[in-house]
Amino acid sequence: EEELQMIQPEKLLLVTVGKTATLHCTVTSLLPVGPVLWFRGVGPGRELIYNQKEGHFPRVTTVSDLTKRNNMDFSIRISSITPADVGTYYCVKFRKGSPENVEFKSGPGTEMALGAKPSAPVVLGPAARTTPEHTVSFTCESHGFSPRDITLKWFKNGNELSDFQTNVDPTGQSVAYSIRSTARVVLDPWDVRSQVICEVAHVTLQGDPLRGTANLSEAIRVPPTLEVTQQPMRVGNQVNVTCQVRKFYPQSLQLTWSENGNVCQRETASTLTENKDGTYNWTSWFLVNISDQRDDVVLTCQVKHDGQLAVSKRLALEVTVHQKDQSSDATP
């Protein structure tokens, strides 16, 4: 006949306060005859958790019908778990004896521990915007989890990042733990639509990790490129000059025209368009009056982007003699 084995398959059982815990125990043989009891702890101080034959165990129910003749499943459920239930639980086989049963074999024990889910990760980016090619730091924090073992990963647009440092506190034993990770991300010019993701995996999440995200649009500043051009066609005695402000982010932009150093207050036509990568283009048209008195006209398009120092582009207006003549003809 095969030797009796007491099988407690879970070495660790994570439970949540208030919930029901199921402690598994099966035997491989019906012999020797005698009951199976459950204990918390070992030695003379151990606590009796369940005895099918006698006693009062209001929070304990059996998974199987222990009265069935060939039952080999002695698993139990303990309801309304509290922190005081933490400990190691043993199912123990007793051999029927006279006058008393004798302890025969114990299972290896199942450690009941309190599990607590981590909070949703919160990702925070830098306080100030940074331009492409520079490195920015993102932090991710999650709190309140137990046990201490936890896995944290960083992604940028689905690609895993490797440049990060993670700390779990406290280092010693605690009821609950916190994780903080800082990732360093190099900004690309097209990162306006990019995301960084902090992913936290923990045993209490049953394979469904928690994610926190941050948009790189909050961290990036893409400075504009400026181009000022003169339109070949003119309208009457006016020449159209265009200032194209390309590929900038964020949208915050102030554009001013000046003519020979004098800021022009008058309204100008403009359009704003959004590019596929999330950056913007701004086009401003400026109409310059052409007259005999104006041989040298220098136009400046000045752009102040997102509170940064102004950048400008100049254009010396090219007015041909023919254009001047036409302009003079038009003057009464």
Partner: antibody
């Protein structure tokens, strides 16, 4: 709520005997290991003895082995400590304590003072 | 037997200030198989029995104010009272239940108000 009430303390001469009792209520007494812990006047705590939930197993600190015996009567929800051959160094407040698993002591009685003096 | 040594023996702290009590074990009370520290803390006020404060090194007993916290692992443990109240005047004991019997206690730390 859990209550542990000790009795049986008093003044006794060296070499004599005393039996302490602890009546338990508010929990299922027969499911728990129980302990005696003592505290000499102005001193710290010293564990004295433990008995299993069913009374079949017990252990004592070396200094009282062979002189003290822990026992219980689950039908009366009562824990006992039989103290024989008492010595002056046994003078202490004796507390009965409920074990939580085989681990810590989650409830304590108010204690009973035993004074061994000639 | 495992010997627990507490420090300091006594401690005077102003009301509202932090009190820190240390407990050092002569051998580890960390069970490597379950990563649990088999250590408890008790509070004993004058003329009263001890009262369980902390078990498994860091779990607060039900009803214990959250100004009490336990930390540490292996052989070095700390009980912290984050903001001392008048009612916290007592003797505090650590206790191990890793290697039993015997259950052993530290010698106690007396906490008073400065």
């Amino acid at each position: 709520q859990v209550q542990l009430v000790e009795s049986g303390g008093g003044v006794v001469q060296p070499g004599r005997s005393l039996r302490l009792s602890c009546v338990a209520s508010g929990f299922i007494f027969s499911n728990y290991g129980m302990h005696w812990v003592r505290q000499a006047p102005g001193k710290g705590l010293e564990w004295v003895a433990v008995i299993s939930y069913d009374g079949r197993n017990e252990d004592h600190v070396d200094s009282v082995k062979g002189r003290f015996t822990i026992s219980r009567d689950n039908s009366k929800n009562t824990l006992y400590l039989q103290m024989n051959s008492l010595r002056a160094e046994d003078t202490a407040v004796y507390y009965c304590a409920k074990g939580s698993g085989s681990y810590y002591f989650d409830y304590w009685g108010q204690g009973t003072l035993v004074t061994v003096s000639s | 037997d495992i010997v627990l040594t507490q420090s300091p023996d006594s401690l005077a702290v102003s009301l509202g200030e932090r009190a820190t009590i240390n407990c050092k074990s002569s051998q580890t009370v960390l069970n490597s198989s379950n990563n649990k520290n088999y250590l408890a803390w008790y509070q004993q006020k004058p003329g009263q029995p001890p009262k369980l404060l902390i078990y498994w090194a860091s779990i607060r007993e039900s009803g214990v104010p959250d100004r009490f916290s336990g930390s540490g692992s292996g052989t070095d443990f700390t009980l912290t009272i984050s903001s001392l109240q008048a009612e916290d005047v007592a003797v505090y004991y650590c206790q191990q239940y890793y290697n039993t019997p015997p259950w052993t206690f530290g010698q106690g730390t007396k906490v008073e108000i400065k």
